[in-house]
């Protein structure tokens, strides 16, 4: 009886097992009863990192350095290239696909730490008491207002994103 | 499209001064942090100055603290940079930077050479 199911490494296809091509190669053509899979190593500047049946391998990433981009590790047949940003950028993404200057943190979040050639801005959330209504790469988060020493009161709470708003203490008549 | 021209930059004995200027079009001017930032040769970039939206926060690098003063001007879309007391180690090429600023959004930048 034909198989529902295969080993590890192996593809079911025309009712049979077929072991699939190993990484840094790609399928030519599917086992028969008589044959083995054929796998081809892939090409200069291609690359496939898992067991498969791709008939066609993938082309490394391009560094692109109009973008910013340079190479940190270069691919193999089972590896994709890795790029990384000039000194002094960092990427945009893990994926590191374009580089900027600097992060900036968004409202609700203060620099703890700018920027360097090395590292990129390090951000922290407002603390309580604290603000931050805009996005920076370099404003830490703001203490709220104090009302008191302005001999006013708070006629609406703070936030990590707003200050506080103070407004005049009700005279009793 | 975001356009940023630096001008203002040339030969400088150490000791003077030289005043920087960035004309921005292409954006909400007045809504952006910016940034004045340097590369010296063969080094990597580094973080001068910077300034709020409305200027009235400021950020500088402890190594120009006290010699250089970063200024904008809404009205008419320019961001400033005035530099006293320049030294040797100033001579860079100066870029003016909004948020977030890309790799590729660079413009050309202003020499600013300190050398007697």
């Known amino acids: 009886e034909p198989p529902t199911a295969c080993r590890e490494k192996q593809y079911l296809i025309n009712s049979q097992c077929c072991s699939l091509c190993q990484p840094g190669q790609k399928l030519v053509s599917d086992c028969t009863e008589f044959t083995e899979t054929e796998c081809l190593p892939c090409g200069e500047s291609e690359f496939l990192d898992t067991w498969n049946r791709e008939t066609h391998c993938h082309q490394h990433k391009y560094c692109d350095p109009n973008l910013g981009l340079r190479v940190q590790q270069k691919g193999t047949s089972e590896t994709d290239t890795i790029c990384t940003c000039e000194e002094g950028w960092h990427c945009t993404s893990e994926a590191c696909e374009s580089c900027v200057l600097h992060r900036s943190c968004s409202p609700g979040f203060g620099v703890k730490q700018i920027a360097t050639g090395v590292s990129d801005t390090i951000c922290e959330p407002c603390p309580v008491g604290f603000f931050s209504n805009v996005s920076s790469a370099f404003e830490k988060c703001h203490p709220w207002t104090s009302c008191e020493t302005k001999d006013l009161v708070v006629q609406q709470a703070g936030t990590n994103k707003t200050d506080v708003v103070c407004g005049p203490q009700d005279r009793l008549r | 499209e975001v356009q940023l021209l630096e001008s203002g930059g040339g030969l400088v004995q150490p000791g003077g001064s030289l005043r920087l200027s960035c004309a921005a079009s292409g954006f909400t001017f007045a809504g952006y942090e910016l940034w004045w930032v340097r590369q010296a040769p063969g080094k990597g970039l580094e973080r001068v100055s910077a300034?709020?939206?409305?200027?009235?926060?400021?950020y500088y690098a402890d190594s120009v603290m006290g010699r250089f003063t970063i200024s904008r001007d809404n009205s008419k879309n320019t961001l400033y940079l005035q530099m006293n007391s320049l030294r040797a180690e100033d001579t860079a090429v100066y870029y003016c930077?909004?948020?977030?600023?890309?790799?590729?959004?660079r413009g050309q930048g202003t020499l600013v050479t300190v050398s007697s």
């Open positions: 300034i709020n939206p409305q200027g009235t926060r400021t």
């Open positions: 930077a909004k948020l977030p600023f890309m790799f590729d959004d």
